[in-house]
C-alpha cells in the first residue's frame, strides 16, 4: 500500500548546467493522494533558505505525479545557485533535496578574448 | 518488479572502444540515476560514476575521468557506458546500478557485463 | 576521497554463530540533510551484489531480522545474528554522502 504523505522527488545533489538568455523551468516532481499542498520555491544563501514570492510558477499534472514548475524566462546569471522546493501538508513542513543551477554567462563567454586573439595581441590581459 | 538488464559479455583488443548498455524494466530512468560500478578479477566494488537521464548530467570518480563516457536514452529507457582506448586495466565485470528517485542508496543491480581485453 | 576500510578482511564462523563487521570512513558520513548515506551490500560467489541494509540500519525487504546496521558518524557495524549458509559471501560497506561515492575493500565472510 502506497503511503498517502506528500512526497517531493527532487534528486539528491541534482544538477542542471543552462545557459543564460535561455528560458528554464525547475521541476519539483510532487505527488500527493487527496488534496493538492501548497509548495514553494526558496534559494539558498548559505544554511537558510530565502522564498521565491515574486516569481512566475505554474502546476503541470500527469498521471500519477504533479510538477510544480519554477520559470526562469530568462535565465539571469544571478540565477545561479542552488534551490529547494517545499511542500504543506496537515501542518507539516516536508523540504525537497535541493538542486543546483550552474549558469553559463554566453555573453560574457564569447566577449572573453579567444585565446589566439590573447597570443597576438598580450595586452589585451592588462586592459 | 524492476529489472536491470545489461549486455553481453565483450572481447575487445587493446585500444579499441566498446559501449555497454542497461535496460531497464519496472521503473523510467528518468526518474532515477543510473551508476556504472566495476569489479576487476577477484577484486572489490569501485564506483565509476552516475548519469542522471532526465537532463543528461554525469559524476565521475577523477580516477575514470577521460577514461569512461556515461550516456542514456530516455525514449528506450537505456544507460549506456563507453570506454575508449581499452587497456588490460579496462578488464572487468561492469555493473549498472540504479537510485530510484536519485536517493544515493543504490537500490537495483544488473546481472553484469564482463569485458575482457586482449590481443 | 572518503576513504571505506572495512575489518576483518576475512570472518571464518562456524553456521549458528554470530558474526560482525566493522566499517570506518575517513570523515563523518553525516549530511547537511541530517541523514547518513551508508549501505551494507553482499555478494554471493558468483552473483551480482544485493543491497542489505541502507541509511546506517534500516533493513531492505526480504532481508531477515537477523542483520542489524548499526553506528553514526564514522564508526559503522554490521551485525549477523546466527549466521546461515546463504549468508556466506562478501559484504561491501559504501559511502554514499560526498563525490566520488567509495566502496570498502570487502569483508569475506567463510566457515570454519
Known amino acids: 500500500k502506497e503511503s498517502c504523505d506528500v512526497q517531493l522527488y527532487i534528486k539528491r545533489q541534482s544538477e542542471h548546467s543552462i545557459l543564460a538568455g535561455d528560458p528554464f523551468e525547475l521541476e519539483c516532481p510532487v505527488k500527493y493522494c487527496a488534496n493538492r499542498p501548497h509548495v514553494t520555491w526558496c534559494k539558498l544563501n548559505g544554511t537558510t533558505c530565502v522564498k521565491l514570492e515574486d516569481r512566475q510558477t505554474s502546476w503541470k499534472e500527469e498521471k500519477n505525479i504533479s510538477f510544480f514548475i519554477l520559470h526562469f524566462e530568462p535565465v539571469l546569471p544571478n540565477d545561479n545557485g542552488s534551490y529547494r522546493c517545499s511542500a504543506n501538508f496537515q501542518s507539516n513542513l516536508i523540504e525537497s533535496h535541493s538542486t543546483t543551477l550552474y549558469v553559463t554567462d554566453v555573453k560574457s563567454a564569447s566577449e572573453r578574448p579567444s585565446k589566439d586573439e590573447m597570443a597576438s595581441r598580450p595586452w589585451l590581459l592588462y586592459r | 518488479e524492476v529489472h536491470l538488464q545489461q549486455s553481453g559479455t565483450e572481447l575487445m583488443k587493446p585500444g579499441a572502444s566498446v559501449k555497454l548498455s542497461c535496460t531497464a524494466s519496472?521503473?523510467?530512468?528518468?526518474?532515477?540515476?543510473m551508476h556504472w560500478v566495476k569489479q576487476r578479477p577477484e577484486q572489490g566494488l569501485e564506483w565509476i560514476g552516475r548519469?542522471?537521464?532526465?537532463?543528461?548530467?554525469?559524476k565521475f570518480d577523477p580516477k575514470f575521468q577521460g577514461k569512461a563516457t556515461l550516456t542514456s536514452d530516455t525514449s528506450s529507457n537505456t544507460a549506456y557506458l563507453h570506454f575508449s582506448s581499452l587497456t588490460s586495466e579496462d578488464a572487468a565485470v561492469y555493473y549498472c546500478?540504479?537510485?530510484?528517485?536519485?536517493?544515493?542508496?543504490?537500490?537495483?543491480w544488473g546481472q553484469g557485463t564482463s569485458l575482457t581485453v586482449s590481443s | 576521497e572518503v576513504v571505506m576500510t572495512q575489518t576483518p578482511l576475512t570472518l571464518s564462523v562456524t553456521i549458528g554463530q554470530s558474526a560482525s563487521i566493522s566499517c570506518k570512513s575517513s570523515?563523518?558520513?553525516?549530511?547537511?540533510?541530517?541523514?547518513?548515506?551508508l549501505n551494507w551490500f553482499l555478494q554471493r560467489p558468483g552473483q551480482s551484489p544485493k543491497r542489505l541494509m541502507h541509511?546506517?540500519?534500516k533493513l531492505d525487504s526480504g532481508v531477515p531480522d537477523r542483520f542489524t546496521g548499526s553506528g553514526s558518524g564514522t564508526d559503522f557495524t554490521l551485525k549477523i545474528s546466527g549466521v546461515e549458509a546463504e549468508d556466506l559471501g562478501v559484504y561491501y560497506c559504501?559511502?554514499?554522502?560526498?563525490?566520488?561515492?567509495?566502496f570498502g575493500g570487502g569483508t569475506k565472510l567463510e566457515t570454519k
Open positions: 546500478v540504479s537510485d530510484h528517485y536519485g536517493s544515493s542508496l543504490l537500490d537495483y
Open positions: 519496472g521503473l523510467n530512468i528518468r526518474d532515477t540515476y
Open positions: 548519469i542522471d537521464p532526465a537532463n543528461g548530467n554525469t
Open positions: 570523515q563523518s558520513l553525516l549530511d547537511s540533510d541530517g541523514k547518513t548515506y
Open positions: 541509511l546506517v540500519s
Open positions: 559504501w559511502q554514499g554522502t560526498y563525490f566520488p561515492y567509495t
